[in-house]
């Protein structure tokens, strides 16, 4: 931090390393949840026009796909990964990429993913080819 | 030597409008996305907008979307900051920061990557 920035005692807007170095936000989409077109494709676009600065740097890009009876929704926004999102674990968030991992929840098929390289959450992932984890 | 010079701060009434400059040089400016970032008093730092390069694309913070305008001269090596609509909670150091393509950390030398920063006021 440089000299003539003051130091906060509950700081969780600037993170740092041991050397004091401080660490940029992510740029992630953010549009919440709009109804989406997106279905039975490999990767789709988010069709989110908004790419803001995260409040945290620590925060990543997250993208909630689900579907139900009725309709189709995306959701993009930023989230702290030490956190749970929709009760899951971000597991994923150093990757570069945002690839779709499907989550348990009744009622709807629900697919999540958490990137940290700007806007990663723009371009959503469902591809087994680039899902190099345990199929369990 | 890297310098980046903020100026334009002042006090202001809510509801009003500033612009903020920051004047760069040492290096190339048309390398770096730039940013704009603020402290109030006591707080930590808020990342409020950025633009890059080329280009000109911009990215706000959520808390000054559609109140704050960045922008970019590069054939004078200067960043602004247009802030309207201005709130009690806008009162802060407002600092220019620049940042490489890929970069994620930013050193904590000031002469390195910071201004000194000036102060916006909005306070009736």
């Known amino acids: 931090i440089p000299p003539h920035v003051q130091k906060s005692v509950n700081n969780d807007m600037m993170v740092t390393d041991n050397n004091g170095a401080v660490k940029f936000p992510q740029l992630c989409k953010f549009c919440d949840v709009r109804f989406s077109t997106c279905d039975n494709q490999k990767s789709c676009l988010s069709n989110c026009s908004i790419t803001s600065i995260c409040e945290k740097p620590q925060e990543v890009c997250v993208a909630v796909w689900r579907k139900n009876d009725e309709n189709i929704t995306l959701e993009t926004v930023c989230h702290d990964p030490k956190l749970p999102y929709h009760d899951f674990i971000l597991e994923d968030a150093a990757s570069p990429k945002c690839i779709m991992k499907e989550k348990k929840k009744p009622g709807e098929t629900f697919f999540m993913c958490s990137c940290s390289s700007d806007e990663c959450n723009d371009n959503i992932i469902f591809s087994e080819e680039y899902n190099t984890s345990n199929p369990d | 030597e890297v310098q980046l010079l903020e100026s334009g701060g002042g006090l202001v009434q809510p509801g009003g409008s500033l612009r903020l400059s920051c004047a760069a040089s040492?290096?190339?400016?048309?390398?770096?996305r730039m940013w704009w970032v603020r402290q109030a008093p006591g707080k930590g730092l808020e990342w409020v907008s950025?633009?890059?390069?080329?280009?000109?694309?911009?990215y706000y913070a959520r808390s000054v979307d559609g109140r704050f305008t960045i922008s970019r001269d590069n054939s004078k090596n200067t960043l602004y900051l247009q802030m309207n609509s201005l709130r009690a909670e806008d009162t802060a150091v407002y600092y220019c920061?620049?940042?490489?393509?890929?970069?994620?950390?930013?050193?904590?030398?000031?002469?390195?990557?910071w201004g000194q920063g000036t102060l916006v006021t909005v306070s009736s």
């Open positions: 040492g290096f190339t400016f048309t390398e770096y």
């Open positions: 920061a620049k940042q490489m393509p890929g970069q994620k950390w930013m050193a904590k030398s000031r002469f390195d990557y």
């Open positions: 950025a633009i890059e390069p080329i280009g000109n694309r911009t």
